[in-house]
């Protein structure tokens, strides 16, 4: 466990004559605040994915009013650091997004208005416990200068905050198998504290609070022997009685979400859905009012003038959650008809239609046959954006302009000879065969496997195919 710390040094216009006007004016005084979002750096997450490592909101900066005629200076900043606590190991490589927000303090109806001034992002390698790393980034006409570091919370140490340290019990040396804790040489590396009750014989841990089982043992505390008998249900009946294998502790076990938040598992970790009035990775931030600007992504905050009365975030299209922190996967509703591809552009939904379909939701079937003529008595058939002609007998091709050779496919079986005919084809069957395609053998006694031939047609006669 540990804390990521971000220090904003300055936010102001970039160099050069095209410097931006101050974001505040005498008529509209304003103040700045910052938001940081952290994600594991090498995750294959989409840009809109939640801040899996955590997020933080700064306090508000001092109120600033532009001095008429003066160039926009660096703007006054909030006091203190932005701190993002992390519970698990520090990943070493992380991605960040830092947003600079302006809060206008004019006489808006419904309270202050917020707007995003600048957003910077990056991916960096950073060892916990190292020195402050500095950065300078441009965002539009603005320039942001900041420093950041990750530090472990005692007793954790190390570049990933996974080793634990305890004060030495003896003045001279550490216990058996335990090394001194660099750089805290007066402390010793502590044995990991596994989940309470974890079997000392059959369980072990690589991180504090976990309980991993040796082969042949299962259960949350590794006290249940794995039996070879089959389980009756997918999870198995009560593992304590049968010894069936059950899934190990999940990320939501013990509900890491505080303040009544509900936990849902994600592919990599967990996500807390917080009740109104709370937010943060584990719903740990409370006493929030609209003055704290809790609504992200342009959400409008209503109510909550004092910490006891909850606020409500009215989210813009495409966002949801008590703080508008979750992007709605609007494509999951499959709004595009007729096989169209759905694109969520954030500000709007777009459907990329398959050929032959149009409209905002690909709902219009284009008339493929409009102005298309099929020759020689063929009829036009619509389908999937391409017109097709169903041709009259004896004709083929895309527009039924080609005279078809009905014998090209060798339709006469058993050596029968094919003759093209104005209304189709005729098969002259070889001795011993009959039928429209010479498909039936004639029995030696002269009887046919078919019902009696129509009058005037003897077995062996050419059978005309109508």
């Amino acid at each position: 466990a540990g804390v990521f710390e971000l220090q904003i040094h300055s936010f102001g216009p970039g160099p050069g004559p095209g410097a931006p006007r101050s974001p505040c004016s005498a008529r509209l005084p304003c103040r700045l605040f910052f938001r940081v979002c952290l994600k594991p750096g090498l995750s294959e997450e989409a840009a809109e994915s939640p801040c899996a490592l955590g997020a933080a909101l700064s306090a508000r900066g001092p109120v600033y009013t532009e001095q008429p005629g003066a160039p926009a200076p660096d703007l006054p900043l909030p006091d203190g650091l932005l701190q993002v606590p992390f519970r698990d190991a520090w990943p070493g490589t992380f991605s960040f997004i830092i947003e600079t927000w302006r809060e206008e303090l004019g006489d808006q109806i419904g309270g202050p208005a917020w707007s995003l001034l600048a957003r910077v992002a990056g991916r960096r390698r950073l060892a916990a416990g190292g020195p402050w790393a500095r950065d300078i980034q441009r965002a539009g006409a603005w320039e942001l200068r900041f420093s950041y570091r990750a530090r472990c919370e005692p007793p954790a140490v190390g570049t990933a905050c996974t080793r634990l340290c305890r004060p030495r019990s003896a003045p001279s040396r550490c216990g058996p198998g335990l090394r001194p804790c660099a750089p805290l040489e007066d402390e010793c590396e502590a044995p990991l504290v596994c989940r309470a009750g974890c079997s000392p014989e059959h369980g072990f841990c690589e991180q504090p609070g976990e309980c991993r089982c040796l082969e042949g043992w299962t259960g949350p505390l590794c006290t249940v022997p794995v039996s070879t008998s089959s389980c009756l249900s997918p999870r198995g009946p009560s593992s304590a009685t049968t010894g069936c294998l059950v899934p190990g502790p999940g990320p939501c076990d013990g509900n890491p979400c505080a303040n009544g938040g509900s936990c849902s598992e994600t592919p990599r970790s967990f996500e807390c859905t917080c009740p109104r009035g709370f937010y943060g990775l584990r719903c740990e931030v409370s006493g929030v009012t609209c003055a704290d600007g809790p609504c992200f992504n342009g959400g409008l905050c209503v109510g909550g003038a004092d910490p006891d009365s909850a606020y409500i975030c009215h989210c813009p299209p495409g966002f949801q959650g008590s703080n508008c922190e979750k992007r709605v996967d609007r494509c999951s509703l499959q709004p595009c008809r007729n096989g169209g591809l759905c694109l969520d552009l954030g500000h709007a939904l777009r459907c990329r239609c398959r050929a032959g379909f149009a409209g905002p939701r690909c709902e219009h079937d284009l008339d493929d046959c409009a102005g298309r003529a099929c020759a020689n008595g063929g009829t036009c058939v619509e389908g999937g954006g391409a017109h097709r002609c169903s041709c009259a007998l004896g004709f083929g091709g895309r527009d039924c302009r080609e005279r078809a050779d009905p014998c090209a496919a060798r339709p006469c079986a058993h050596g029968g000879r094919c003759y093209a005919h104005f209304s189709g084809l005729v098969c002259a069957c070889a001795p011993g065969y009959m039928g429209a395609r010479c498909e039936f053998p004639v029995h030696p006694d002269g009887a046919s496997a078919l019902p009696a031939a129509p009058p005037g047609l003897r077995p062996g006669d050419p059978q005309r195919y109508l």
């Epitope: 989409a46 840009a47 990056g122 790393a133 441009r138």
Partner: antibody, heavy 117, light 107 residues
Amino acid sequence: QVQLVQSGAEVKKPGASVKVSCKASGYTFTRYWIHWIRQAPGQGLEWMGYINPTTVYTEFNQNFHDRVTMTRDTSTSTVYMELSSLRSEDTAVYYCARGGSNFFDYWGQGTTVTVSS
Amino acid sequence: AIQLTQSPSSLSASVGDRVTITCRASENIYYNLAWYQQKPGKAPKLLIYTANSLEDGVPSRFSGSGSGTDFTLTISSLQPEDFATYFCKQAYDVPPTFGGGTKLEIK
């Protein structure tokens, strides 16, 4: 106006070292980083690393990590880049550039380094 | 390191033409892309940073767009002084990397 002026062309033998200077003027020297970028003949651009003149913190491209050194002299607003153990493939034009992590807004005129036996 | 693929690698056009050069990143780099112009024997010059911000002093006929993995540099009406090589550069991850360049020549 902002200017970055680099030292003159160099011809070196394989195995030797070269030290290129970059003198900054027209702005507060410690306010921006100085990056080094090189361009081999007819090739693209390759970032080598940067120095923060305030803290003397340096960060390098792994391709050069063990061969490059960057230093600065605040009294003359000059940054130096030294590349050791030169080989023929180090023949290139070496540029210094002012900037932060996501922009290089002013560049020096370039220094041609030729490595030949 | 993040790879940037520029296309086309060379392009012939006439004065007054509208020209588009594209740059594709091997992974999401948000809006951390810059465009540079380089003329023979000269240092590169910054044109666009953070995908669409025009550097001071750069003519407004140059514009940048895109975010994520796909980016575009557009010159709305080519001028004689625009014939040069153009490079894109990502600054999301360390080390910063450059595209292979697009050489814009007079037709």
